[in-house]
Amino acid sequence: CKAMHVAQPAVVLASSRGIASFVCEYASPGKATEVRVTVLRQADSQVTEVCAATYMMGNELTFLDDSICTGTSSGNQVNLTIQGLRAMDTGLYICKVELMYPPPYYLGIGNGTQIYVIDPEPCPDSDF
């Protein structure tokens, strides 16, 4: 396993609709044709997998149908979007990139993006 640099933004604020987007960029050390991208969430020293996708270079990033993530790839950067976020989902979201094929295998893990999610206030009843 060889190490690889990964960059991602330090902080992102989710929209009022609970959507957060960020770029994950990796320093590809060679001609990888198969890449796997995983988003991990770290909160209270617990790390859980949020979503993952494997893609072939030049093709679209495809997550499972029930995934809360969507994304697009362009060269050695991936544009990730996480949907359905609520305040309790606030945490550090880490981008993990693996160059699966051809060998050698490379692994890169970013420093994480702190995503802040604020639940919208309910609209007050209006007396009209």
Partner: nanobody, 126 residues
Amino acid sequence: EVQLVESGGGLVQPGGSLRLSCAASGDTLESFAVGWFRQAPGKEREELSCIGRTGEFTDYPGSVKGRFTITRDNSKNTVYLQMNSLRAEDTAVYYCAAERLVFHLCSLSEYDYDTWGQGTQVTVSS
């Protein structure tokens, strides 16, 4: 749309040095990571080096590490490849390529670059 033009190639004796330039027009190069590649007749294109947008991140394959150095001058919209201790097997057409990125990294994979120069010939011979 950024356009790239390589220069600085030519004939050099074994053991000699050359500095190649990759000049950009049409856009500011500071928005782009830049890579250098070469292709010898009958061979696949080979990665040589890359440099991130700010110049703080560079990468080289083992084959040229220590002999080749990549630098950039964003004020001149130019990236340079300094090549020392040249050998006959370094004879090839040398290309630079650019990729618009968000952060400071760069890629050694030709698949990641979407803008290429026309190339400059380097011949190492006595």
